[in-house]
Interface confidence: low
C-alpha cells in the first residue's frame, strides 16, 4: 500500500517528466524545427494541387507520405521507457509510485504533447499550401487522423520496447513492421487485388487506417476531369473522374462509417498496445 | 614506388576481401535469405497483375518499392571503408598497396557481388510471380536497372562514408537523402507538376532514374482498358488506357533514349560518387 494517492503520484511523475522536457529543450525544439522544414518542403513540392489526373496522384502521394512519416517518426518513442528503465525499477522498488502512476504520467507529459505537435504543424502548413478540400471539418479531420496515426504507432513502439534495455533491437523490429505495414497501406498495392489468404494482413496496418481515412476525407466530392461535361465524353467508362470513383476503385466504403471506422480501429490499437506496454512494465518489476 | 604492380596488389586485396566474405558467410547468407523471403512476399502480394486500372497502380507500386528498397538496402555499404579504416591506414603506411589497389579491390570483391545478388534474386522471383512484360529483353533490362540503382546508391554511400570513423552519422545522412530522393522519384508526386524552381532536384534522385527506367520498360505497349476497342471511346481524354498514355502523363519520354538516358545518368552518378570516395581515401592517408 502507498502513502500517496494515484492522482498525487501521477501529478508528480508528469511534473518531473515535463520539467525534464523543458529543462532539455534542444530535442523538442529540434523536432519542431525539422517538422516545420519538412512541412514547408512538402508544401512547396505539392503546392496548389490540380483537379485533374495529376491531382489524384499528388493527393494520394502526399497523404501516403504524411501517414508513413508519422509512423516512422514514432519509432523514436521506443526510448520512452527504455532510457529510464533502471531509474524506474529503482524508484518503483523504493515505493515512490505505482506502475500505473509512472505509466500514465509518462504518457501524459511526454508522449501526448510530443506526438500531437507534428500532426498540428503538418496540417497547418500543408493544408493551405496544397489547397486541400476547403472545409473546416476536413481540416480538423486530417489533423485528428494524423494524431491518431502518431499515437497508435507510438503505442506500438512502447509495446515492443517496454522493459527492454537496448533501443536498437526494438527500433529494427519497428522499422521492419512499418515497412510491411506501408506496403499494405493502399498506395503501393490496390488492396482489392490482394489474394484473400494474404489480404487480412491489411487490418494490422496502422498506416492503412490513417491513409484510408485521409483519402476518404479529401477525395469525397472532388472532380478530376476538368471541362468534363455530360454531352461529350459520356462513354468515358475507364476514367476516374470523381473522388467517389477513385475511392471505390481503392475498395473504400463511401459512407461516413467508412471514414470513422478507421479512427475506431486506430483507437482499439492504441488501447491494445498500451495495455501490452503496461503489462510488460508490470512483469518487469516482478522479475527485477 | 612499390615493389609489386597495381594488378598484383588488386588481386591480393580482392582475394583477401573475398576470403573474409566466404570465411564469415553468415552476413552474406542472411542477406540472401532476407532477399528471397522479401521477394516471395512481394511476389505473393502482387501475384498475377491485372490489365486494368488496378494493374497500373500495382505495377507502379511494385516498381517503386523495388527501386526504393534497392536504395535503402544500399545504406549498409557505408561500412565498406569505415570498418577497416584503421587497418587500411596501417597497411597503406606500411607500403602494402596503393590507395587505388585497395579501393578497386574492395569494390570488385565486396561491393560488386553483394549488390548484384539482390537485383538478380528480386528479378528472378518477382518477374514471373507478377507476370510482368513477357519478353526476355524486358526481363534483363529490369535486372540491369535494379543493379544500376544498387550500385549508384552504394557509390553514394561510399562517397559519404569514406574516411569516417563512425557509421551512424553517414547512415543518418544517407537515410535523409534517400527520403527526399524517394519523394522525387515520381510515384508520390507527378514530376510534371512540381514548380520549376524545385523540379531540378529530381535530376539528383537515384530512385527517380531507376523508377523511370523500370516504368518505361514495363508500361510501353501495355493496354489497361479491358475489352476497349481503339476505334471506340477515343473521345475519352481522361482515361489512361495504354502504357504510353500513362508514361506521357508522368512526363516520361517514350523513345528508346527515354529508357537508356536513365542508365547513363546512373552510370555518371556511379563514376562521380566513386571518384569522391577515392579522393576522400587519398586525402585520408595524407592526414593520417
Amino acid at each position: 500500500s502507498y502513502t500517496t494517492s494515484f492522482c498525487h503520484q501521477l501529478r508528480w511523475v508528469s511534473k518531473r517528466s515535463f520539467k525534464n522536457l523543458l529543462g532539455n529543450p534542444q530535442a523538442s525544439i529540434a523536432q519542431i524545427i525539422v517538422t516545420v522544414i519538412l512541412g514547408l518542403v512538402i508544401g512547396a513540392i505539392y503546392f496548389g494541387l490540380n483537379n485533374d489526373s495529376t491531382g489524384i496522384q499528388n493527393r494520394a502521394g502526399v497523404l501516403f507520405f504524411l501517414t508513413t512519416n508519422q509512423c516512422f517518426s514514432s519509432v523514436s518513442a521506443v526510448e520512452l521507457f527504455v532510457v529510464e528503465k533502471k531509474l524506474f525499477i529503482h524508484e518503483y522498488i523504493s515505493g515512490y509510485y505505482r506502475v500505473s502512476s509512472y505509466f500514465f504520467g509518462k504518457l501524459l507529459s511526454d508522449l501526448l504533447p510530443m506526438r500531437m505537435l507534428p500532426s498540428i504543424i503538418f496540417t497547418c502548413i500543408v493544408y493551405f499550401m496544397l489547397g486541400l478540400k476547403p472545409t473546416a471539418d476536413a481540416f480538423f479531420i486530417m489533423m485528428f487522423t494524423l494524431m491518431m496515426v502518431a499515437y497508435s504507432a507510438s503505442s506500438m513502439a512502447l509495446a515492443i520496447a517496454a522493459g527492454q534495455s537496448v533501443v536498437s533491437v526494438a527500433t529494427l523490429l519497428m522499422t521492419i513492421c512499418f515497412v510491411f505495414m506501408m506496403i499494405f497501406s493502399g498506395l503501393l498495392v490496390n488492396l482489392t487485388t490482394i489474394a484473400s489468404w494474404l489480404s487480412w494482413l491489411q487490418y494490422f496496418s496502422i498506416p492503412r487506417y490513417g491513409f484510408t481515412a485521409l483519402q476518404h476525407n479529401e477525395f469525397l466530392g472532388q472532380n478530376f476531369c476538368p471541362g468534363l461535361n455530360a454531352t461529350v465524353n459520356n462513354t468515358c467508362n475507364y476514367a476516374t473522374c470523381t473522388g467517389e470513383e477513385y475511392l471505390t476503385k481503392q475498395g473504400i466504403d463511401l459512407s461516413p462509417w467508412g471514414l470513422w471506422k478507421n479512427h475506431v480501429a486506430l483507437a482499439c490499437m492504441i488501447v491494445i498496445f498500451l495495455t501490452i506496454a503496461y503489462l510488460k512494465l508490470l512483469f518487469l518489476k516482478k522479475y527485477s | 614506388s612499390y615493389t609489386t604492380s597495381f594488378c598484383h596488389q588488386l588481386r591480393w586485396v580482392s582475394k583477401r576481401s573475398f576470403k573474409n566474405l566466404l570465411g564469415n558467410p553468415q552476413a552474406s547468407i542472411a542477406q540472401i535469405i532476407v532477399t528471397v523471403i522479401l521477394g516471395l512476399v512481394i511476389g505473393a502480394i502482387y501475384f498475377g497483375l491485372n490489365n486494368d486500372s488496378t494493374g497500373i497502380q500495382n505495377r507502379a507500386g511494385v516498381l517503386f518499392f523495388l527501386t526504393t528498397n534497392q536504395c535503402f538496402s544500399s545504406v549498409s555499404a557505408v561500412e565498406l571503408f569505415v570498418v577497416e579504416k584503421k587497418l587500411f591506414i596501417h597497411e597503406y603506411i606500411s607500403g602494402y598497396y596503393r590507395v587505388s589497389s585497395y579501393f578497386f579491390g574492395k569494390l570488385l570483391s565486396d561491393l560488386l557481388p553483394m549488390r548484384m545478388l539482390p537485383s538478380i534474386i528480386f528479378t528472378c522471383i518477382v518477374y514471373f510471380m507478377l507476370g510482368l512484360k513477357p519478353t526476355a529483353d524486358a526481363f534483363f533490362i529490369m535486372m540491369f536497372t535494379l543493379m544500376m540503382v544498387a550500385y549508384s546508391a552504394s557509390s553514394m554511400a561510399l562517397a559519404i562514408a569514406a574516411g569516417q570513423s563512425v557509421v551512424s552519422v553517414a547512415t543518418l545522412l544517407m537515410t535523409i537523402c534517400f527520403v527526399f530522393m524517394m519523394i522525387f522519384s515520381g510515384l508520390l508526386v507527378n514530376l510534371t507538376t512540381i514548380a520549376s524552381w524545385l523540379s531540378w532536384l529530381q535530376y539528383f534522385s537515384i530512385p527517380r532514374y531507376g523508377f523511370t527506367a523500370l516504368q518505361h520498360n514495363e508500361f510501353l505497349g501495355q493496354n489497361f482498358c479491358p475489352g476497349l476497342n481503339a476505334t471506340v471511346n477515343n473521345t475519352c481524354n481522361y482515361a489512361t488506357c495504354t502504357g504510353e498514355e500513362y508514361l506521357t502523363k508522368q512526363g516520361i519520354d517514350l523513345s528508346p533514349w527515354g529508357l537508356w538516358k536513365n542508365h547513363v545518368a546512373l552510370a555518371c552518378m556511379i563514376v562521380i560518387f566513386l571518384t569522391i570516395a577515392y579522393l576522400k581515401l587519398l586525402f585520408l592517408k595524407k592526414y593520417s
Epitope: 483537379n51 466530392g221 472532380n223 471541362g227 468534363l228 461535361n229 455530360a230 454531352t231 459520356n234 467517389e244 | -
Partner: antibody, heavy 120, light 106 residues
Framework: EVQLVESGGGLVQPGRSLKLSCAAS????????MAWVRQAPTKGLEWVAY????????YYRDSVKGRFTISRDNAKTTLYLQMDSLRSEDTATYYC?????????????WGQGASVTVSS | DVVMTQSPSLLSASVGDRVTLTCKGS??????LAWYQQKLGEAPKLLTY???SLHTGIPSRFSGSGSGTDYTLTISSLHSEDLATYYC????????FGPGTKLELK
Amino acid sequence: EVQLVESGGGLVQPGRSLKLSCAASGFIFSRFYMAWVRQAPTKGLEWVAYINTGGGTTYYRDSVKGRFTISRDNAKTTLYLQMDSLRSEDTATYYCTTLAAPWNYVMDAWGQGASVTVSS
Amino acid sequence: DVVMTQSPSLLSASVGDRVTLTCKGSQNINNFLAWYQQKLGEAPKLLTYKTNSLHTGIPSRFSGSGSGTDYTLTISSLHSEDLATYYCYQYNNGYTFGPGTKLELK
C-alpha cells in the same frame, strides 16, 4: 444521347409539398454534380440547388433553404427535388441540369422542364 | 451576391449582321462567365463558358470575350436560327444569371 426528363410538376396550393424527379440517361450519371434551375413566367433564370456526385454535399439558394431538399439515387440515375412549404413565388418551370465540372458550376445538359404552379 | 446586368434588353438586327451583346457584373468575376441561348418554349443551351471557351457543337460564329466586370458575346454573322433570348451567367461568387437580352429580327 444525353437525356434528362423531369416529372412531378403540377398545380399545388401554398404551404403544400411537391416532389420533382429527373430521370437521366445517355451518360455516366454518378460522375456528375447535378442542379435544379428555375424560370418564373416572363422572368429570367434562377439557380435553385446543386448536389455532388455522392449526394453528401448539397447547396441551396437562400430563398429555398430549409424548404427544398435536393437528393439523388445513382443506382436509378435519378435526381429529386423535394419542395415543402411552397409559396406563390416558387411558381416556375424547373429544369434539371448537369454541372460541367466542379468547381466550375456551368449548367451543361438541360431537361425540357417541369412546370410548377403554386396557387390557391 | 453578384448582380448581373445585360444591355440592351431588346436588340433588333438583320440576318448577316455582326451582333454584340454585353454583360456587366457588380464586381470582378474573374472570367467565370458563361452565355446561354434560350428559344421560346425550349430549355436554355450552353454557348460559351470561362468567358471564351466554345461549348461542343456550337458554331464558330459565336465568340466570348471580356475580363473583370465587363463581358461580351459576339455573333459574327447573324443567322435566322440565332433569334432567341441570351443570358449571361456568373459562377465566380455565388451563381447568378443576367436578366437576358432578347434578339429579334429588324
